[in-house]
């Protein structure tokens, strides 16, 4: 399906509005430090050029690839060397190496100021004054902070963002209407970004086969009535979409995602009975809805898998002669029967099955060797089940904040070299698994919990990759994508760690803590907790609890004091001394 001009093709397919939005996202994800105005200028130039190509596909440069066009445009930025340093060297390269170079310089933790939400009236005025600029700025700010955000999904978020302002800026109580909507978009956006980051990591670090295996398992759970050929087609198409988005090919990605949604809706009878409502929605909502659709009911009359994959004496012949189809079919059949398992567990089972066949099909009596392969699955299934049971009990006992604290201590002891902000961020997110998943019945707990933990641990992995400090983190992150969580769970206290020198400044607090939101105050306390553990990794739970309780009382007391700053200074010194004594520092 070759087109004379790729840029004209995508402009026509996507329409001007989506074209401009996607180019802005692409540029902001590549050049994360560039000012908004510079990006808008570049986008406008690209859009004008695209229009000339739509008018005449044979016009000069219209036959160039999108990477060439976009890369050339990015390389016109005057301050590239001063702002981005060695990233400027990318511009000396030819495509496709230039694009690969830009991709390698994407920063998961860019040094950007935190987004501060203005007053509602200020936001509404800005929205009414220039709606287009207001929405572009939203795309720009999210894209530059989340360089792997799933671009077509960001268009959906922007549509909801616009709808929130359109509705709430006319409301009697603007703040009551708008703020909860913005909070929801922020939280969903962070979750969406993290989920997509895992997909990109899967593709980039472990390859297409790993991503396809994940997709087979997930789609088979979601569409258990769809036959293998249908699931395989969806997996191939979905892999193409995510490969494009993760590779910075956002126009192709959005276009192909729309085609995939169209195909799914045209063939929903052979895919899932749950798609009807999704398929009645407009494009962006439709694609989002399909991505989140609940699992269809399992078909009736599914026979045991043992007959074909264990009991048959021809397993090795089938495996040898049609490896990928045979293993793919195994994963598909197992996953559609087990919506109660996490995707990563299903992939572990498939890997165990494959390893067993590799070993047994070379043995003297293959059938005798692989006859008990399903027995090997039992401990693999029980391990996450037990872990989730124990942690949900702990969560129900402690509540979210204290459960997060328990995880903070646990993970700081495992990998104390990791930076405190990363440990706080990751442990807080790990702790959210409780309120997210423990409310579910048994049959939904594991897929909710373990697949969510995979997303969170990937955040740790990508942040750690930027500045590696722990061999243990590197090992767990790189050895096996599906065994990351068991790898981290299995880590004990790092006995090689030399405790951090005590620094009183780390434990000095000021009156500004009193004006922080509850969430920000929690983060301050949790930051102190991580630092405590780094100073005293052998501290017991009881010791840490006593210090944290004293700390909470100290903050509460000083925030009620008339002279807050004096209170923090004087009582703070006492608290540090008492804590040192309690912990034997």
């Amino acid at each position: 399906d070759a087109h004379k001009s790729e840029v004209a093709h995508r402009f026509k397919d996507l329409g001007e509005e989506n074209f401009k939005a996607l180019v802005l996202i692409a540029f902001a994800q590549y050049l994360q430090q560039c000012p908004f105005e510079d990006h808008v200028k570049l986008v406008n130039e690209v859009t004008e050029f695209a229009k000339t190509c739509v008018a005449d596909e044979s016009a000069e440069n219209c036959d160039k690839s999108l990477h060439t066009l976009f890369g050339d445009k990015l390389c016109t930025v005057a301050t590239l060397r001063e702002t981005y340093g060695e990233m400027a060297d990318c511009c000396a390269k030819q495509e496709p190496e230039r694009n690969e170079c830009f991709l390698q310089h994407k920063d998961d933790n860019p040094n950007l100021p935190r987004l501060v939400r203005p007053e509602v009236d200020v936001m509404c005025t800005a929205f009414h004054d220039n709606e287009e600029t207001f929405l572009k700025k939203y795309l720009y700010e999210i894209a530059r902070r989340h360089p792997y955000f799933y671009a077509p999904e960001l268009l959906f978020f922007a549509k909801r963002y616009k709808a929130a302002f359109t509705e709430c800026c006319q409301a009697a109580d603007k703040a009551a209407c708008l703020l909860p909507k913005l909070d929801e978009l922020r939280d969903e956006g962070k979750a969406s970004s993290a989920k997509q980051r895992l997909k990109c990591a899967s593709l980039q670090k472990f390859g297409e086969r790993a991503f396809k295996a994940w997709a087979v398992a997930r789609l088979s759970q979601r569409f258990p009535k769809a036959e293998f050929a249908e699931v395989s087609k969806l997996v191939t198409d979905l892999t193409k979409v995510h490969t494009e988005c993760c590779h910075g090919d956002l126009l192709e990605c959005a276009d192909d995602r729309a085609d995939l949604a169209k195909y799914i809706c045209e063939n929903q009878d052979s895919i899932s009975s749950k798609l009807k409502e999704c398929c009645e929605k407009p494009l962006l909502e439709k694609s989002h809805c399909i991505a989140e659709v609940e699992n269809d009911e399992m078909p009736a009359d599914l026979p045991s898998l043992a007959a074909d994959f264990v009991e048959s004496k021809d397993v090795c012949k089938n495996y040898a002669e049609a490896k990928d189809v045979f293993l793919g079919m195994f994963l598909y059949e197992y996953a559609r029967r087990h919506p109660d398992y996490s995707v990563v567990l299903l992939l572990r089972l498939a890997k165990t099955y494959e390893t067993t066949l590799e070993k047994c099909c070379a043995a003297a009596d293959p059938h005798e060797c692989y006859a008990k392969v399903f027995d090997e699955f039992k401990p693999l299934v029980e391990e996450p089940q037990n872990l989730i049971k124990q942690n949900c009990e702990l969560f129900e006992q402690l509540g979210e904040y204290k459960f997060q604290n328990a995880l903070l201590v646990r993970y700081t002891k495992k990998v104390p070299q990791v930076s405190t902000p990363t440990l706080v961020e990751v442990s807080r997110n790990l702790g959210k698994v409780g309120s997210k998943c423990c409310k579910h019945p048994e049959a939904k707990r594991m897929p909710c919990a373990e697949d969510y933990l995979s997303v969170v641990l990937n955040q740790l992995c990508v942040l750690h990759e930027k500045t590696p400090v722990s061999d243990r983190v590197t090992k767990c992150c790189t050895e096996s994508l599906v065994n990351r969580r068991p790898c981290f769970s299995a880590l004990e206290v790092d006995e090689t760690y030399v405790p951090k020198e005590f620094n009183a400044e780390t434990f000095t607090f000021h009156a500004d803590i009193c004006t922080l939101s509850e969430k920000e105050r929690q983060i301050k306390k949790q930051t102190a907790l991580v630092e405590l553990v780094k100073h005293k990794p052998k501290a017991t739970k009881e010791q840490l609890k006593a210090v944290m309780d004293d700390f909470a009382a100290f903050v509460e007391k000083c925030c009620k004091a008339d002279d807050k700053e004096t209170c923090f200074a004087e009582e703070g010194k006492k608290l540090v001394a008492a804590s040192q004594a309690a912990l034997g520092l």
């Epitope: 036959e227 293998f228 045991s304 009991e311 048959s312 021809d314 089938n318 189809v325 045979f326 059949e333």
Partner: antibody, heavy 120, light 107 residues
């Protein structure tokens, strides 16, 4: 509608050849092991062989050599090539879908069958 | 392997409880199916994996057994149940075998 339709049966002389077709509709044949089963007049069911999702064919011992199963996924059709036909090959030939891609059973979906008569 | 069904024919009345057995020449675990066939029609799957009832099949049909010995039971015969019944063993290899058949007729 999910169904299987056999065709290609008819009268053939001893020693002759015949190719039966089984056209699938409402599902993709490549996802399943597709079987051929025959039933001589007034007799029981006799499995001939199947072709699985890995395109590997298996046959009953008695069918090896004379019978060949193949498929064309683009046409969503499976075939049974029968050579050196004998009078005892006279039967209704059924096409049946396995439960999965590598399944030898059970068979929930069957065609209506096509009659093959071997006679001079 | 071979499957032997007994009896080869059976006469019974509406309302009767009927039992058909199927014996395998070697263990096939629970990989046995039961089919019902009426003249001029293809077989219809009743039971799979020895005891699992196919959706849409009346609950008066039940299956049991494992290893080498299997049973199909019709708890209370209905007029539409008069037909020929076959067992099928599968899963031990990529081949499959049908039983010899049991013809159930009206007494």
């Amino acid at each position: 509608e999910v169904q299987l339709v056999e065709s290609g049966g008819g009268l053939v002389q001893p020693g002759g050849s015949l190719r039966l077709s089984c056209a699938a509709s409402g599902f993709s044949l490549s996802s399943y092991a597709m079987n051929w089963v025959r039933q001589a007049p007034g007799k029981g069911l006799e499995w001939i062989g199947h072709i699985n999702a890995g395109d590997i064919a298996y046959y009953a011992t008695w069918a090896k050599g004379r019978f060949t199963i193949s498929r064309d996924n683009s046409k969503n059709t499976v075939y049974l090539q029968m050579n050196s036909l004998r009078a005892e090959d006279t039967a209704v030939y059924f096409c049946a879908r396995g439960a999965g891609g590598f399944s030898t059973g059970p068979f929930k979906l069957w065609g209506q069958g096509t009659l093959v008569t071997v006679s001079s | 392997f071979e499957l032997t069904q007994s009896p080869s024919s059976l006469s019974a009345s509406v309302g009767d409880r009927v039992t058909i057995t199927c014996q395998a020449s070697e263990s096939i675990n629970s990989r046995l199916a039961w089919y019902q066939q009426k003249p001029g029609q293809p077989p219809k799957l009743l039971i799979y994996d020895a005891s699992d009832l196919t959706s849409g099949v009346p609950s008066r049909f039940s299956g049991s057994g494992s290893g080498t010995d299997f049973t199909l039971t019709i708890s209370s015969l209905q007029p539409e149940d008069f037909a020929t019944y076959y067992c099928q063993g599968y899963g031990g290899s990529s081949t499959t075998t049908f039983g010899t058949g049991t013809k159930l007729t009206v007494l």
